[in-house]
Each structure stands twice: as C-alpha cells, then as structure tokens.
C-alpha cells in the first residue's frame, strides 16, 4: 500500500485502565499530531481505522467488532471497551486514511488488575490540600463522557478499603469529596467507585487518586538561611580545608522553584579561579517544606581565599534573601622560646581566641 | 515498636455475645486500619472483617454479617471485636491484625484471645 | 470467595533442605497474595506480600513467586526454627481468603 505518515509508538500515552470497566479511548492523531479534529477529517472523507498487536505479538491484526454485547465499539474517534479484559493489553493504533492521505499513530493499552482495596499497578494523581487551610475538594476524575447528563450515577467514596461516610472532616458530595479541614492524617490514597447503567447493565469507573497534605500559603514565608550565621566563625589556617554548609528552610509554595546558590566576592564560584566544589542535599518535611543544604568546600584554603567574602542566596517564589559566612584566617598561638618560658615561669602553652564555635 | 494486646479468655454461653479488645501502641493508630481474624482449634485461620481506624468504617466477610461488629475507639486507640448469638463453632482464637488503609496482608497481629462456647 | 488450595498439606524435611511450598487459588488473584508462619501457640507473623516481596526482617533464604493462581513459597535452607505451619492469602477480592495451611515438620 502507499506511504503513510508514520508517527510510531506514542509512549507518552501510556493508557493504564482497570480489567472489567469501560474504558473510552480517544486516538492520539486528534490531540496532540495532527491540526484539525476529527469532524473535520471525517468531512473530508478520510477514514478512521483502528487495529492492534497483542502484548507479546508482532503481528498486526484487525481489532473485532462484532464482539457480543458490542464489548469492543468505535464513536467517533472514540475506541470503546464495554468493558475491558485482561488480554486487551497491547498495542492500538488509530489510522486516518483516504486514498491521497494516511496518517497513523500506535500507543500502549495495559489493562491493570486491582486489589480489594484498589491497589493496582496504575500510576496516581496526586492532589495536594493545603493543611488547616478551610475546605477543599477533590473530584472524581477522569468520568466525562461515559454516561450522559440524564444518568445519574452513584458515586461512593473509599481511603484505602474503606468507605467514607459520617466522618467530621471528610465529606462525599457526589462527584466531589470535600476535606471541611485537611490534617497530615488525612494524607492516603481515595478511590471514587462511579456505578451507572447502560442497556440493562451496570457498569464501574474506579478512580484512585493520592491526597498529599501540604504546607498552607497562609504559614508560608521567605527563604529561611539557618547558617552561615552570625554565631558562626569559620577560623582556618592556609592549607586546611575550608567547609562552609549554606541551610535554607523553605516553606512549600505550589509550583515555587526553590533556589540556593553561593557567591564567592559577588561572583558565581565558577568564575573564580579556585577550586571549589559545592555538594547540594534536599530533604523535606511532612507537609512537604523544603531544606536545601549546600556545601561549599575548598579542599586547601590560602591566605588569600580566607580574605574572600562568601555569601549564601536562598530564592523561592516568597522573595530572596542572603547572608554572608564569617571567614577568618586563624591567628597562631604565640610560641615561647624555651628560655622565655623558663624566665615567666610558664607551665602551659597560650591558647587562641575565644569565639562562639569554630569549624 | 508497634504492639496490639488483647484483652483476655473468654468463657460464654451459647446465644450470648462476647466483646474483646485490642489496644495498639507503638505506632499513629489513625494512619491504620484493624482487621481481626480467628482461628477455630486445630483449624486455619478465617478473616472477619476489618475497620478504619480514622473513619470507623467497617468492611466484614458475607459469613459474618450481621453478627459482628467491629469499631475503633481513636482516643483510646483501641479496636473492637462484637460476635453475637454464638454457638459452640465459633469456638477459636480471635486475633486483630494491623494494616495499612490501603493494605491487604496483615502485618502486626495480636496475641490472641481465646472465647469458649459452652453451655 | 476465593478459595485458596495449599499443598502439600504436610511437608516432612530435614534442617538444611529445600522446602517449596504451594498455593493455587480458585480465580486469578494477579499478584495480590501474602504468605505467613504460624508457630504453635503463637500468632501468625508475615512472610511475603504482594506474591514475592519479603517482610520486613524476615530473613533472605525465604523467597516468593507466582503470579494469577499459582504461588509458591520457597525456603531455601530450612533452619530448626523454620518448622512451623504456613498459610497463604489473597486480597484481591473480598472477603479476603487464607489457605488451609502447610505444615512443614522436622523428618
């Protein structure tokens, strides 16, 4: 047959559904390759054909259509399972053609097993709720399109195994599940199980997503720098090495991009001829605040870079801040000649200057 | 380390009802949930039924409905397992078994509670 | 429900022996399946969840595989406090199902 624009195996759609619910699949060619819709194909006479290779299989084949039940269906540019099996797993492709035009797209369909407590191998939305923040909702998603507006489905809403009904904070409102106040307890997975009928059947959607608690935008503030500090005196002698930890505190802030970085006499480290390495750790607190540490370490400091001026800058969405370290070049204790020593009279050695810590 | 400890034996009479309980430490008895589980003497082990420790919602095998009830108490941190009109079969070991909300195997369990249905 | 078949139902070895023991269920339960020990007088401890995925601190010579409705449980060097009484769960469906057990006892 003749040439067909070939847009290969689309892995960015990796369609996860569940075994033994509907699932409506939309062909790729429509949203994200091609720049006019499906209505607009079929206007201009091109055909839609789907077809597919089983998991394991390299031959192409036919997908059937005459299923009992219609169990397996086109609409549109929609491919319809009512409901899937296990062995629809594979790979679908969705082909636009006429006899001028061909234009095709393959993608991975895995129909995934779950538990009884909606554990499965598919991947989750997670949904972030400020904590203590006032009341937020979550919604069911993914349903639109599988029943028309005159249905109206029962939704029942789980944590885990377990069905959400009376609770004091947690309250299912249809489509909706409504968090009155969120505490970090209420951090897990829910599944909205959609149960609506179509021809005499009944049929399941399950939704799982994860609630993540976060910190609450009415709590958050600027970058917090908790060293260098001004307790801090980093007292070296020329050629040991020189270890300067930068530790911020950032609040969460959603889609804030937290910065650290040095500056070594107002300019990056990289543009100083020394050699310096910075090594970075993250870790993060329940409600999803940040503390970023950067090291800046100089392996065998000279007189000269213990005279340099080393500032930490910490940036998040909350503003910038920045503080310098306290570098000294150590003053060596005096050294008593032996004879000096006799004439005082001195039993000990004279000690350095006091400070707060040394490092 | 997390531990669940039962309340002790039982002795009861065919017809009556028995309540044992099972306190667990060691661990946010919120984030879990609590199943319990017997085992008949000389016999394997049969589930029950299960509840959520935050949402007090129970799920119970078709065999016991309407017999148990299974409740938690989070101030105390305490589950609770009710059988009524017992009979002399369900003489056995009534065990509560933690887990996760979310979780299907069991993975901190009691010690045990032996009930005795005798006339 | 789901019934869930153990075999052997007595497994007569010696310390040091290779022990494989059996679970089948009536229905695929995917990988949704947990294996415990049970000791005399004692409450059961778990082994493996999720078909093959070991508990914690439960030591490496006790693996599990299988997938669908058959599972097995393998002890590769059984050691003198490995004898006791193992039984199989699945949590795919409700309510959730054990096996009638597998003794495994000194020879």
């Known amino acids: 047959s003749e040439r067909c624009d070939d847009w290969g195996l689309d892995t960015m759609r990796q369609i996860q559904v569940f075994e033994d619910e509907p699932a409506r699949i939309k062909c790729p060619l429509f949203e994200h390759f091609l720049k006019f819709n499906y209505s607009t194909a079929h206007s201009a006479g091109l055909t839609l054909i789907w077809y597919w290779t089983r998991q394991d299989r390299d031959l192409e084949e036919p997908i059937n259509f005459r299923l009992p039940e219609n169990r397996i269906s086109k609409e549109k540019d929609v491919l319809w399972f009512r409901p899937t099996l296990l062995n629809d797993t594979g790979n679908y492709t969705c082909m636009l053609r006429n006899t001028t035009y061909c234009s095709k797209v393959a993608f991975p369909l895995e129909v995934v097993q779950k538990d009884s407590c909606f554990n499965s191998p598919m991947k989750l939305p997670v949904h972030k709720l400020y904590i203590e923040y006032g009341i937020q909702r979550i919604t069911c998603p993914n349903v639109d399109g599988y029943f028309p507006s005159s249905v109206k489905p029962t939704i029942t809403w789980y944590m885990g195994c377990y069905k959400i009904q009376n609770f004091n904070n947690v309250i299912p409102e249809g489509m909706n599940l409504s968090f009155l106040i969120a505490f970090i307890s209420n951090n897990g997975n829910y599944t909205c199980v959609v149960t609506y009928p179509e021809n005499g059947r009944t049929f399941h959607l399950t939704r799982t997503l994860t609630v993540k608690v976060v910190g609450s935008p009415k709590n958050a503030v600027p970058p917090v720098i908790h060293s260098p500090n001004d307790h801090v005196v980093y007292e070296k002698e020329p050629g040991e090495e020189l270890l300067i930890p930068c530790t911020v505190y950032f609040s969460f802030l959603m889609d804030s991009r937290n910065e650290v970085w040095w500056t070594i006499d107002g300019k990056k480290p990289d543009d100083i001829p020394i050699d310096v390495t910075i090594n970075e750790s993250i870790s993060h607190s329940r409600t999803e605040d940040e503390t970023r540490t950067q090291i800046l370490s100089i392996k065998k400091v000279t007189s000269e870079d213990l005279k340099r001026s080393y500032v930490c800058h910490a940036r998040s969405a909350k503003g910038e801040v920045a503080k310098a370290a306290t570098v000294k070049q150590k003053v060596p204790a005096p050294r008593y000649t032996v004879e000096l020593a006799c004439g005082f009279g001195a039993t000990g050695s004279g000690s350095g200057s006091h400070h707060h810590h040394h490092h | 380390q997390v531990q669940l400890v039962q309340s002790g034996a039982e002795v009861k009479k065919p017809g009556s009802s028995v309540k044992v309980s099972c306190k667990a430490s060691?661990?946010?008895?919120?984030?879990?949930?609590i199943s319990w589980v017997r085992q008949a003497p000389g016999q394997g082990l049969e589930w029950m039924g299960g509840i959520s420790a935050i949402f007090g919602t129970a799920n119970y095998a078709q065999k016991f409905q309407g017999r148990v009830t299974i409740t938690a108490d989070e101030s105390t941190s305490t589950a609770y397992m009710e059988l009524s009109s017992l009979r002399s079969e369900d003489t056995a070991v009534y065990y509560c078994?933690?887990?996760?909300?979310?979780?299907?195997?069991?993975?901190?369990w009691g010690q045990g509670t032996l009930v005795t249905v005798s006339s | 429900e789901i019934v869930l078949t153990q075999s052997p139902a007595t497994l007569s070895l010696s310390p040091g022996e290779r022990a494989t023991l059996s679970c089948r269920a009536s229905?695929?339960?995917?990988?949704?399946l947990a294996w415990y020990q049970q000791k005399p007088g004692q409450a059961p401890r778990l082994l493996i969840y999720g078909a093959s995925n070991r508990a914690t601190g439960i030591p490496a010579r006790f693996s599990g595989s299988g997938s669908g409705t058959d599972f097995t449980l393998t002890i590769s060097s059984l050691e003198p406090e490995d004898f006791a009484v193992y039984y199989c769960?699945?949590?795919?469906?409700?309510?959730?199902?054990f096996g009638q057990g597998t003794k495994v006892e000194i020879k």
């Open positions: 078994a933690r887990h996760l909300h979310n979780g299907i195997h069991l993975d901190y």
């Open positions: 060691g661990g946010t008895f919120s984030s879990y949930a």
């Open positions: 769960q699945q949590g795919k469906h409700w309510p959730w199902t």
């Open positions: 229905q695929s339960v995917s990988n949704f």
